[in-house]
Interface confidence: medium
């Protein structure tokens, strides 16, 4: 299906969750002129990108764990 990119959002679809062991890093983009929604973009250990649903409880736990891990290093 064709997807028209409205605004400049990078997440056109989102995953509800992903295994933490597959994630290298997570970038949380706040809403702005470029995009009206919060975007959670995970960089996977295989180098690929995946957009995660910021409203998903599983994703929120992943973000919390990764941020906590980063602050303890």
């Amino acid at each position: 299906a064709s997807v028209v990119t409205e605004l400049r959002c990078q997440c056109l679809q989102t995953l509800q969750g992903i295994h933490l062991k597959n994630i290298q890093s997570v970038n949380v983009r706040s809403p702005g002129p470029h995009c009206a929604q919060t975007e959670v973009i995970a960089t996977l250990k295989n180098g690929k990108k995946a957009c995660l649903n910021p409203a998903s409880p599983m994703v929120q736990k992943i973000i919390e764990k990764i941020l906590n891990k980063g602050s303890t290093n």
Partner: antibody, heavy 125, light 107 residues
């Protein structure tokens, strides 16, 4: 073959107007954002404006805000840049560029992967 | 606005050399950065997207790396056709901004 062809450039006096066109072919035009980028003589690249696939969202550099208007006609596969109140500092080669780049189903990046050949605009009295 | 600063502004090198160009963003842009090559009188050409991904058809001697604020473009074993001007560009937020360019010249 994916192609972009600009037209409409030329010599115009300060304060004058010009409309640039960019004819697209070889891809589904309405699906992709498009940008205008300019390059003054001997200078670097400067992004001017962008427009979303449907035309519903537009973006401008501060240097052209209020003077330039980007638009598109998806039925004609054409991108436009209406330039009003032109100044000497607007003198440049103007390029249109396609913002392509789907990576995975869940992530999209915006890269100017196809460019036109450029059309020169000279603002001088 | 996000400022992009490239260094060096110009660079002289010989065929076969390994060259590195750096680009620094005024704030973190994740890996939302591209590299373009431009030859005199021609339109720019996309080389690297998202900091480290090689655009289709671009020779493997080109590579990109970096994330956050610091990025590099490396050309291994320079070829005669590589002498050109190189630009980085961020798309993390609008206005989109380019670096000032790095002119790569033959020594």
């Amino acid at each position: 073959e994916v192609q972009l062809l600009e037209s409409g450039g030329g010599l115009v006096q300060p304060g004058g107007s010009l409309r640039l066109s960019c004819a697209a072919s070889g891809f589904t035009f309405s699906e992709l954002s498009m940008s205008w980028v300019r390059q003054a003589p001997g200078k670097g690249l400067e992004w001017v404006s962008a427009i979303s696939g449907s035309g519903g969202s537009t973006y401008y550099a501060d240097s052209v805000k209020g003077r330039f208007t980007i638009s598109r006609d998806n039925s004609k596969n054409t991108l436009y840049l209406q330039m009003n109140s032109l100044r000497a500092e607007d003198t440049a080669v103007y390029y249109c560029a396609r913002e392509g780049g789907r990576l995975e189903p869940y992530y999209y990046y915006y890269a100017m992967d196809v460019w036109g050949q450029g059309t020169p605009v000279t603002v001088s009295s | 606005d996000i400022q992009m600063t490239q260094s060096p502004s110009s660079l002289s090198a010989s065929v076969g050399d390994r060259v590195t160009i750096t680009c620094r963003a005024s704030q973190s842009i994740s890996d939302n950065l591209h590299w373009y090559q431009q030859k005199p009188g021609k339109a720019p050409k996309l080389l690297i997207y998202d900091a480290s991904n090689l655009e289709s058809g671009v020779p493997s001697r080109f590579s990109g790396s970096g994330s956050g604020t610091d990025f590099t473009l490396t050309i291994n074993s320079l070829q005669p056709e590589d002498f050109a001007t190189y630009y980085c560009q961020q798309y993390y937020s609008t206005p989109l901004t380019f670096g000032q360019g790095t002119k790569l010249e033959i020594k």
